[in-house]
């Protein structure tokens, strides 16, 4: 008499998360009698998945009609598969007894679950950096399977090369996560730039997922300061202009000081944007020269985005010949400068 065989025809089955998995198992004989049980894993720690004799297994249904009297098909269907269901499933025949005795196991069917990666989330640096500095962006995606995955970084459409990527865990797992860091050197023109993290996986059918970050969140473009004096007016008033140009972000406070005393403070708001995303701002100060007997030291002080203040200073000299005036005289553009205005 031929020995009973437990046949699991498929060595492996791959299923997309959310779908149903069919695990096939047939026996070559109804004798000896005894239950068929399905387990995930082998050995003492194996997990009972389905007992065709008794029990409540809401996600598992027999493929064959269990009311067939000569049934030798013990295949099961597991619904709503998740990555946690991955593993090797064994169809095991027991011989009836008290308790039932394991008689023979099938060779096992490895169930792998194809799970889509989550939408990539890109995060940038916690603090802004200025041009020529390098900042790091991180991209994370989770919950995918199988482990093979491709991640690319782009800045304004150009692929970045200074990238470090890790897929965890290194060993076998029901699902995986990817974390990648890209280092980007900032330029003053990067206010409108964008970095893209692109993830390609077998479950995405060639349509990669993308996460983006705007460099505007990471960059600070410090302003240029230029102080100029317009022509002396007939009423002995000098119009001094402080031009603050090419800065980003808009958060900026300008303070005028006369001889070290605050004359006026202004906050930038609702400024028009330059083509490159930066902003310009001009502030005027009228100085009544005749009201001063001594020279007047004017300072344009700019605090940008919480950074230390940048000053431009110059002196207006009270002259015996006030009508002899300079025209469009500019203070220098670096450091703290003083300029004598006649």
């Amino acid at each position: 008499e031929e020995e009973l065989q437990v046949i699991q025809p498929e060595k492996s089955v791959s299923v997309a998360a959310g779908d149903s998995a069919t695990l096939n198992c047939t026996v070559s004989s109804l004798i000896p009698v005894g239950p068929i049980q399905w387990f995930r894993g082998a050995g003492p720690g194996r997990e009972l998945i389905y007992n065709l004799k008794e029990g409540h297994f809401p996600r598992v249904t027999p493929v064959s009609d269990p009311t067939k009297r000569n049934n030798m098909d013990f295949s099961i269907r597991i619904s709503n598969i998740t990555p946690a269901d991955a593993g090797t499933y064994y169809c095991v025949k027991f011989r009836k007894g008290s308790p039932d005795v394991e008689l023979k196991s099938g060779a096992g069917t490895e169930l792998s679950v194809r799970a889509k990666p989550s939408a990539p989330v890109v995060s940038g640096p916690a603090v802004r950096a200025t041009a020529e500095h390098t900042v790091s962006f991180t991209c994370e995606s989770h919950g995918f399977s199988p482990r093979d995955i491709t991640l690319k970084w782009f800045k304004n459409g150009n692929e970045l090369s200074d990238v470090q990527t890790n897929v965890d865990p290194a060993g076998k797992s029901v699902s995986y996560s990817i974390r990648s860091t890209a280092r980007v050197v900032l330029t003053r023109r990067d206010v409108h730039s964008q970095v893209i993290c692109e993830v390609a996986h077998v479950t995405l059918q060639g349509d990669p997922l993308r996460g983006t970050a705007n460099l505007s969140e990471a960059i600070r473009v410090p302003p240029f300061l230029e102080v100029t004096q317009q022509s002396m007016r007939a009423d002995n008033q000098v119009n001094v202009t402080c031009q603050v140009t090419k800065f980003y972000p808009q958060r900026l406070q300008l303070t005028w000081l006369e001889n070290g005393n605050v004359s006026r403070t202004e906050m930038a708001s609702a400024l028009p944007e330059n083509k490159d995303g930066t902003y310009n701002w001009t502030s005027w100060l009228l100085v009544n020269v005749s009201a001063h007997r001594d020279d007047v030291k004017l300072t344009c002080q700019v605090e940008h985005d919480g950074q230390p203040a940048v000053n431009k200073s110059f002196s207006v000299k009270v002259s015996a010949h006030p009508k002899e005036q300079g025209s469009n005289t500019a203070a220098e553009n670096t450091g703290t400068n003083e300029r004598n205005i006649y």
Partner: antibody, heavy 120, light 106 residues
Framework: EVQLLESGGGLVQPGGSLRLSCAAS????????MSWVRQAPGKGLEWVSA????????YYADSVKGRFTISRDNSKSTLYLQMNSLRAEDTAVYYC?????????????WGQGTLVTVSS | SYELTQPPSVSVSPGQTASITCSGD??????ACWYQQKPGQSPVLVIY???KRPSGIPERFSGSNSGNTATLTISGTQAMDEADYYC?????????FGGGTKLTVL
């Protein structure tokens, strides 16, 4: 409470036909296989035929194969046995029996039986 | 085809233990069921899967099955247990019954 009620028995001449019915109640009819078992006067039980819950699989004893047809109407919770080319040896009380529902099912409920007499 | 053999009759005194046997080739590898049939009544399942008792069946009914023989045991037999008893191999597409055993309670 599970109930099985057979009907359709009677006297029929050899070579004639008869259709037995079994009306079921008290359980989900489509979830269980059903069988016909007969008992000739003063004799033992003889299994005749079985049908799976969906009706897709049918089984017959060699003694009735080709002459009897088992069927079911799950919408009416009714089991049938169409008996053709009847012979004297088919004379018996015919019981309809419900399978227990496991993979090795006993007959856990039986009807009261209907007598079929084949005689000229 | 598979055959099951039962003794045609068994006698027992009230209160004693009655044993009814059912023999078949490697019957112990199969599940045995037992039915009780009283005169003029339909059969009633008393034992299934060798040893299990359906609800409503008294504890005095028990079963065993190994080798080539299944046994129905009625301990403390009562007069009401007098009936025909049929064994069945409950595992194949064609349900096989034994010839039946008439239990007489003396």
């Amino acid at each position: 409470e599970v109930q099985l009620l057979e009907s359709g028995g009677g006297l029929v001449q050899p070579g004639g036909s008869l259709r037995l019915s079994c009306a079921a109640s008290g359980f989900t009819f489509s979830s269980y296989a059903m069988s016909w078992v007969r008992q000739a006067p003063g004799k033992g039980l003889e299994w005749v035929s079985a049908i799976s819950g969906s009706g897709g699989d049918t089984y017959y004893a060699d003694s009735v194969k080709g002459r009897f047809t088992i069927s079911r109407d799950n919408s009416k919770s009714t089991l049938y046995l169409q008996m053709n080319s009847l012979r004297a040896e088919d004379t018996a009380v015919y019981y309809c029996a419900k399978d227990g529902g496991s993979y090795y099912p006993p007959f856990d409920y039986w009807g009261q039986g209907t007598l079929v007499t084949v005689s000229s | 085809s598979y055959e099951l053999t039962q003794p045609p009759s068994v006698s027992v005194s009230p209160g004693q233990t009655a044993s009814i046997t059912c023999s078949g080739d490697k019957l112990g590898d199969r599940y045995a069921c037992w039915y009780q049939q009283k005169p003029g009544q339909s059969p009633v399942l008393v034992i299934y899967q060798d040893t299990k008792r359906p609800s409503g069946i008294p504890e005095r009914f028990s079963g065993s099955n190994s080798g080539n023989t299944a046994t129905l045991t009625i301990s403390g037999t009562q007069a009401m247990d007098e009936a025909d008893y049929y064994c069945q191999a409950c595992d194949s597409s064609t349900a096989v019954f034994g010839g039946g055993t008439k239990l007489t309670v003396l």
